[in-house]
């Protein structure tokens, strides 16, 4: 169970609930696949946490067990053109460390113009986690299609 | 990490473990394009521990960050069913107070007949969430294959 | 809240933290549609903290409200091929004991290769879940694309 | 509200063909599937098939295809149901109907129907 | 194809008494929480008219001595109060696949 606010003395980001909700910022030039997002109550309902933006990318600042969750929506797009433009790939992994780099969850569009999907993942204080989108079809930037999160649920 | 039981006297409700999980009652009349949902142990595997149901809408009662998720299964639907009475797209939204309007999560079946996906999200205390299915086809009453839920993260 | 490390003497899993995130071994014989899983820091990104693998499939060891969720990608798969093959359809449920045996979640991949989902269920101490894979294609056994997990929420 | 406007009743000799029409008002043509019923006289209703307005795409009934074609012209908002090598069991009134808001068929709108009699 | 089967095929009632017809599938017409059996009247010279669609649902403008009930391949139409006005052929109808077939109808007759 959670503990009682009324005995809990130290600030929330010190017990582990580092958690994160970003909406897209950008996509890279042409040769780098990866989604650069941001977050933050001035752009709406994206926040972070304890897990800080580098350059777009999110780094994680706790050791434990995370919930990633990531859902794309592709712009100006119908089933006919997500299996024209295919394969549409989504991947999300660590980036850096280079060390720790490794694919953790990975999506094909084809003929749908959503993926959305979620899996528990060990992740290290220092983990950069990179979301590269492969093919010719941009992302949507609206935020209730495109987001990226991750939550802390247990060292 | 979650407080040892031995030393938790408050209940449950009182440490923030708001949750709920629902699943389909009915659609609304043809120009209601919401969802209603129903929850409690009497009908299944749904419950409802914190947030309330408002006229088959999910009520919120404590603030904080929530993971919200969903999965709506259309009715007798095949590929070719689902790409022929495009678009039917389905979305999550806070409905009301007005003035905290907006919409959380969207996505379009194209040529699936299920959508999934979940989202982490700020809601404050009387916020009622909406799930609106707009397109000409029924979701499906299985409890396996539509449902509808939040669980609470963190203030 | 969490508690505090600094206050919390107790082994983590005596406090409800079980959680599991599992990578798929292999399918069963012809007539069995189950999948087959596993889990440990050996096989990579995968644990079982709390649940066990009985014959590859999870038991669960505490009594509680868990998050359970899924993806599983189709091997050499395009959306012709699932279209093709259809109807191939995942389902997640209790399988034992026989007294409780219920689909929790389902979906069918249409014309898609990927399904992933994720819903809250009660669930009780020795309630074994199975995932069917009913269909003539075969599951990726990459460990980005296919994987299983549940996650205890509250009591 | 929604108008289902059939073509008048027809006289045809056994092997010809029959082409019966089907305007529609009072909603957007492209939006709704048209499907065709007929009734043999004192006999119950059978289903033909079914033609999507919005793509010309259709599904026929077994028992008649090589026989049946469903067409529509957007331009006027008008289906047709031509059937052809007419035998004299082909004697009855066919109706188009139209399926209400969700995309399931079943049918709160019809015309009036139109009778086709085969008779040398 | 699915087979519908009406009983009986013939039925006189007095007005103020319970009319009841029955439709039995040859399989099962429910899916995904819905049974997809709907039930029409008829009158000589007239098109069908829906009266109830997805088994118990009334449609709207249809007076409420109209019901339905049933589920998997047993259907039931209940008219409750019988009136004068509701002499008529009664037709149930499933729509759970292609083709969509018809019961072979219910003549109910008012003594």
């Known amino acids: 169970q959670r503990f009682a606010q009324a005995q809990q003395q130290l600030p929330l980001e010190s017990l582990g609930w580092d958690v994160a909700e970003l909406q897209l910022n950008h996509t890279g030039p042409q040769q780098d696949p990866r989604l650069y997002w941001q977050g933050g109550p001035a752009l709406g309902r994206s926040f972070l946490h304890g897990p800080e933006l580098d350059k777009g990318q999110l780094r994680i600042h706790r050791d434990g067990i995370y919930m990633v969750h990531i859902q794309v929506t592709l712009a100006i797009c119908s089933s006919t053109t997500a299996s024209r433009h295919h394969p549409t790939t989504l991947a999300v992994g660590i980036c850096s460390p280079a060390s720790r780099s490794i694919s953790l969850l990975r999506l094909s569009f084809h003929q749908g113009c959503t993926i959305a999907s979620q899996r528990l993942t060990p992740l290290a204080r220092g983990d950069t986690l990179c979301t590269n989108l492969t093919g010719t079809l941009l992302p949507s930037r609206n935020t209730d299609e495109t987001f990226f999160g991750v939550q802390w649920v247990r060292p | 990490q979650r407080f040892a039981q031995a030393q938790q006297q408050l209940p449950l409700e009182s440490l923030g473990w708001d949750v709920a999980e629902l699943q389909l009652n009915h659609t609304g009349p043809q120009q209601d394009p919401r969802l209603y949902w129903q929850g409690g142990p009497a009908l299944g595997r749904s419950f409802l521990h914190g947030p309330e149901l408002d006229k088959g809408q999910l009520r919120i009662h404590r603030d904080g960050i929530y993971m919200v998720h969903i999965q709506v299964t259309l009715a007798i639907c095949s590929s070719t069913t689902a790409s022929r009475h495009h678009p039917t797209t389905l979305a999550v939204g806070i409905c009301s107070p007005a003035s905290r309007s907006i919409s959380l999560l969207r996505l379009s079946f194209h040529q699936g007949c299920t959508i999934a996906s979940q989202r982490l999200t700020p809601l404050a205390r009387g916020d009622t969430l909406c799930t609106n299915l707009t397109g000409t086809l029924l979701p499906s009453r299985n409890t396996d294959e539509t449902f509808f839920g939040v669980q609470w993260v963190r203030p | 809240q969490r508690f505090a490390q600094a206050q919390q003497q107790l082994p983590l899993e005596s406090l409800g933290w079980d959680v599991a995130e599992l990578q798929l071994n292999h399918t069963g014989p012809q007539q069995d549609p189950r999948l087959y899983w596993q889990g440990g820091p050996a096989l990579g990104r995968s644990f079982l903290h709390g649940p066990e693998l009985d014959k590859g499939q999870l038991r669960i060891h505490r009594d509680g409200i868990y998050m359970v969720h899924i993806q599983v990608t189709l091997a050499i798969c395009s959306s012709t091929t699932a279209s093709r093959h259809h109807p191939t359809t995942l389902a997640v449920g209790i399988c034992s004991p026989a007294s409780r045996s219920i689909s929790l979640l389902r979906l069918s991949f249409h014309q898609g290769c990927t399904i992933a989902s994720q819903r809250l269920t009660p669930l009780a101490r020795g309630d074994t879940l199975c995932t069917n894979l009913t269909g003539t294609l075969l599951p990726s056994r990459n460990t980005d694309e296919t994987f299983f997990g549940v996650q205890w929420v509250r009591p | 509200q929604v108008q289902l406007v059939q073509s008048g009743a027809e006289v045809k000799k056994p092997g010809a063909s029959v082409k019966v029409s089907c305007k529609v008002s009072?909603?957007?043509?492209?939006?709704?599937?048209l499907h065709w019923v007929r009734q043999a006289p004192g006999k119950g209703l059978e289903w033909m098939g079914v033609?999507?307005?919005?793509?010309?795409?259709?599904d026929y009934n077994q028992k008649f295809k090589g026989r049946v074609t469903m067409t529509e012209d957007t331009s006027t908002d008008t289906a047709y149901m031509e059937l052809s090598s007419l035998r004299s069991e082909d004697t009855a009134v066919y109706y188009c109907?139209?399926?209400?808001?969700?995309?399931?068929?079943?049918?709160?709108?019809w015309g009036q129907g139109t009778l086709v009699t085969v008779s040398a | 194809d699915i087979v519908l089967t009406q009983s009986p095929a013939s039925l006189a009632v007095s007005p103020g008494q319970r009319a009841t017809i029955t439709c039995r599938a040859s399989k099962s017409v429910s899916a995904s929480g819905y049974s997809f059996l709907h039930w029409y009247q008829q009158k000589p010279g007239q098109p069908p008219k829906l009266l109830i669609y997805l088994a118990s649902n009334l449609e709207s403008g249809v007076p409420a001595r109209f019901s339905g009930s049933g589920s998997g391949t047993d259907f039931t139409l209940t008219i409750n109060p019988v009136e004068a006005e509701d002499t008529a052929n009664y037709y149930c109808?499933?729509?759970?696949?292609?083709?969509?077939?018809f019961g072979g109808g219910t003549k109910v007759e008012i003594k």
């Open positions: 009072g909603y957007t043509f492209t939006d709704s599937a």
């Open positions: 109907a139209r399926r209400g808001y969700y995309d399931y068929d079943w049918f709160p709108y």
């Open positions: 109808q499933h729509s759970r696949e292609l083709p969509p077939t």
């Open positions: 033609i999507s307005t919005y793509d010309g795409d259709t």
